[in-house]
Amino acid sequence: SAPFSFLSNVKYNFMRIIKYEFILNDALNQSIIRANDQYLTAAALHNLDEAVKFDMGAYKSSKDDAKITVILRISKTQLYVTAQDEDQPVLLKEMPEIPKTITGSETNLLFFWETHGTKNYFTSVAHPNLFIATKQDYWVCLAGGPPSITDFQILENQA
């Protein structure tokens, strides 16, 4: 995947939380759930109460304001979705508060949020060719595309 060293001079400043307590469902209608303390996975649920609820925080880039850059936090926790490398599971990283400024290697906390119709894509800022993805019998990970599923539906007002 692309190195993120070229991004080291870009500073991302926290704006505000723009979404609270939403659920992410993949294209197979599987919801993201907690696998354990560190990882997420996806499963078809009858009861959406078991799904992870996320908050989304928006950041402004010092480079360009036209792109929507976000952080994903598990609601009512201090756990943030953190990118690793291609085909590696995303980690849940605990931080005492939402970072006010993000730069350099910390961009693994950030994702470009793109919507197209009902499809939502989260591209890693640290690895710009890779998306948050679900994969059969695997954790939620970073992937470039099929066979992993990279498009999600946002279900709101689930609280």
């Epitope: 070229f6 979404k19 036209a66 792109k67 919507t115 119709g117 800022v125 710009p128 060719n129």
Partner: antibody
Framework: QVQLVQSGAEVKKPGSSVKVSCKAS????????ILWVRQAPGQGLQWLGG????????DHAQDFQDRLTITVDESMTTAYMELSSLRPEDTAIYYC???????????WGQGTLVTVSS | DIVMTQSPDSLAVSLGERATINCKSS????????????LAWYQQKPGQPPKLLIY???TRESGVPDRFSGSGSGTDFTLTISSLQAEDVAVYYC?????????FGGGTKVEIK
């Protein structure tokens, strides 16, 4: 799938204002940018301005900065475009479009013809 | 503002033949941070609103026939209709959404020869 339904044609006098509405059925504007684009008779497409409701941010083309107002209602289902100090050269079809959080149009309204004539 | 220049202004192509429309931006619309080209292509028929064909320069919108394809990067882009059909007669526009204000090309009218 979101469908956009715009208000009907308007005939206006120079110097007056027009307010065009754009109602989303089958969805809301929550995750989307909304664009307003116009097309003068026989001409191409011109972006007037837009709004990303989730950020409460509006953006206007320089030429319309002083006389364009773009808003969205609280339910996030209807967008409005108001153009003031109308002149004959504002005669055009006005379109709203949405469907992405970038400024391109996946879903388009049917268009509203605004005629400015004394 | 980014200026979008389309060529040709009009194009007459025989049924079943290839139609190629070019679009040039006055500055790059490739965003290095996510390797995406912020460029869309639309088709507009008389009396109708534009219809999205291609976004991110090369991603075909759902339901758009696969004879339509988009290519290019940076400042030079192409919309190709591999085998022109009668229903493809329309005006085609490119649009950049890299920076504000989003801007459109002047349009290319495609007709049947």
């Amino acid at each position: 799938q979101v469908q956009l339904v715009q208000s009907g044609a308007e005939v206006k006098k120079p110097g007056s204002s027009v307010k065009v509405s754009c109602k989303a059925s089958g969805g809301r504007f929550t995750n989307y940018a909304i664009l307003w684009v116009r097309q003068a008779p026989g001409q191409g497409l011109q972006w007037l301005g837009g709004i990303i409701p989730i950020f409460d941010e509006t953006d206007h083309a320089q030429d319309f900065q002083d006389r364009l107002t773009i808003t969205v209602d609280e339910s996030m289902t209807t967008a409005y475009m108001e153009l003031s100090s109308l002149r004959p050269e504002d005669t055009a079809i006005y379109y709203c479009a949405t469907g992405s959080n970038s400024y391109y149009g996946l879903y388009w309204g049917q268009g509203t013809l605004v005629t400015v004539s004394s | 503002d980014i200026v979008m220049t389309q060529s040709p202004d009009s194009l007459a192509v025989s049924l079943g033949e290839r139609a190629t429309i070019n679009c040039k931006s006055s500055q790059s619309v490739l965003y290095s941070s996510n390797n995406k080209n912020y460029l869309a292509w639309y088709q507009q028929k008389p009396g109708q609103p534009p219809k999205l064909l291609i976004y991110w320069a090369s991603t075909r919108e759902s339901g758009v026939p696969d004879r339509f394809s988009g290519s290019g990067s940076g400042t030079d882009f192409t919309l190709t209709i591999s085998s022109l059909q009668a229903e493809d007669v329309a005006v085609y526009y490119c649009q950049q959404y890299y920076s504000s204000p989003p801007t459109f090309g002047g349009g290319t009218k495609v007709e049947i020869k």
